[in-house]
């Protein structure tokens, strides 16, 4: 499992380091989740050939995973702190159902999948403290999520493997874009 936030998973940590700022804590939390995703992707790619599949675009279109777009205000051109923060939180909330789906998809990395899910919940809490306009954040409908989960779990084995691969890849990319945007806030 990756080193929990607050400890340094890298080679050299500076001695006598000042306490982490809120931004640095969020940064560290995202890195922790990304480390977890890397481990899960390793298992997925070793177990199946999904990571090289050319049919992924087909499956991706049916998933509707959160993505950053220009209008979200997270890119340099048209950067808007509040709009972007709302997008990041909304996107993470939308990813939660997909992270729930991942929970029974791993054999050797079961704990890792749970760690990614729980760490994401913590990240959402960190970010909600940072947001001024919580009313603008739309929470996904639990009933819709439940039926989506059922639908995903009813897929054949090949589609389930593909779905797992696409969720991990999209979540990684969403977090990377979020990390870069959050640094500017």
């Amino acid at each position: 499992a990756p080193v929990p936030p607050g400890e340094d998973s890298k080679d050299v940590a500076a001695p006598h380091r000042q306490p982490l700022t809120s931004s640095e804590r969020i940064d560290k939390q995202i890195r922790y989740i990304l480390d977890g995703i890397s481990a899960l992707r390793k298992e997925t790619c070793n177990k199946s050939n999904m990571c090289e599949s050319s049919k992924e675009a087909l499956a991706e279109n049916n998933l509707n995973l959160p993505k950053m777009a220009e209008k979200d205000g997270c890119f340099q051109s048209g950067f808007n702190e509040e709009t972007c923060l709302v997008k990041i939180i909304t996107g993470l909330l939308e990813f939660e159902v997909y992270l729930e789906y991942l929970q029974n998809r791993f054999e050797s990395s079961e704990e890792q999948a749970r760690a990614v899910q729980m760490s994401t919940k913590v990240l959402i809490q960190f970010l909600q403290k940072k947001a001024k306009n919580l009313d603008a954040i739309t929470t996904p409908d639990p009933t819709t999520n439940a039926s989506l989960l059922t639908k995903l779990q009813a897929q054949n084995q090949w589609l389930q493997d593909m779905t797992t691969h696409l969720i991990l890849r999209s979540f990684k990319e969403f977090l990377q874009s979020s990390l870069r945007a959050l640094r500017q806030m």
């Epitope: 940590a13 500076a14 890119f75 990319e173």
Partner: antibody, heavy 116, light 107 residues
Framework: QVQLQQWGAGLLKPSETLSLTCAIY????????WSWIRQPPGKGLEWIGE???????NYNPSLKSRVTISVDTSKNQFSLKLSSVTAADTAVYYC??????????WGQGTMVTVSS | DIQMTQSPSSLSASVGDRVTITCRAS??????LAWYQQKPEKAPKSLIY???SLQSGVPSRFSGSGSGTDFTLTISSLQPEDFATYYC?????????FGQGTKVEIK
């Protein structure tokens, strides 16, 4: 071992368009940001801009009106175009990879000279 | 833009010396700073990221410290292969900006 190989015209006349391409070998194109950085002779480094595999770009405002960075995911390549070049654009141009922090992998550099 | 100022712009040192290079940002950048080494006619090479984390394969005589606006790169015992130019770079915001460089020469 990920490597970046870059190429393009090395000698241009003023007002022409600089065009460089960078290919990624031995690694994934997705999930990274791909930048262009330049270094005029005997001077420091200047970041030009970057592209994500999805095609979203960020540019240095000082060059934005003249720069286009594009991507060809099918070939694992990204390109730089800099229009209306002048002698001030004479530099070594590097492509580089960035994930979360630093530019951890660099191309070999291409010397571009603008001269009439 | 965030300005990055390095000092000194050049220094002379001997093999075995302890060398310190400083980098100052015009505004706070937390610990989002990288250090690079560049040798003549070569591309820069990443040494340190996140102000103090060593890139894999970089000798432990290199270390980085600092947070906010003031940062330091230290070479604990200078080796012949360390004579080069060193650059700091911030990645808190756009555009990414570099220091002007510090050239480490043989005394």
């Amino acid at each position: 071992q990920v490597q970046l190989q870059q190429w393009g015209a090395g000698l241009l006349k003023p007002s022409e368009t600089l065009s460089l391409t960078c290919a990624i070998y031995g690694g994934s194109f997705r999930g990274y940001y791909w930048s262009w950085i330049r270094q005029p002779p005997g001077k420091g480094l200047e970041w030009i801009g970057e592209i994500f595999h999805s095609g979203s770009t960020n540019y240095n405002p000082s060059l934005k009106s003249r720069v286009t960075i594009s991507v060809d995911t099918s070939k694992n390549q990204f390109s730089l175009k800099l229009s209306s070049v002048t002698a001030a654009d004479t530099a070594v141009y590097y492509c580089a990879r960035e994930e979360l922090d630093d530019f951890d992998i660099w191309g070999q550099g291409t010397m571009v000279t603008v001269s009439s | 833009d965030i300005q990055m100022t390095q000092s000194p712009s050049s220094l002379s040192a001997s093999v075995g010396d302890r060398v310190t290079i400083t980098c100052r940002a015009s505004q706070g950048i937390s610990s989002w700073l990288a250090w690079y080494q560049q040798k003549p006619e070569k591309a820069p090479k990443s040494l340190i990221y996140a102000a103090s984390s060593l890139q894999s394969g970089v000798p432990s005589r290199f270390s980085g410290s600092g947070s906010g606006t003031d940062f330091t790169l230290t070479i604990s015992s200078l080796q012949p292969e360390d004579f080069a130019t060193y650059y700091c770079q911030q990645y808190k915001s756009y555009p990414r900006t570099f220091g002007q460089g510090t050239k480490v020469e043989i005394k």
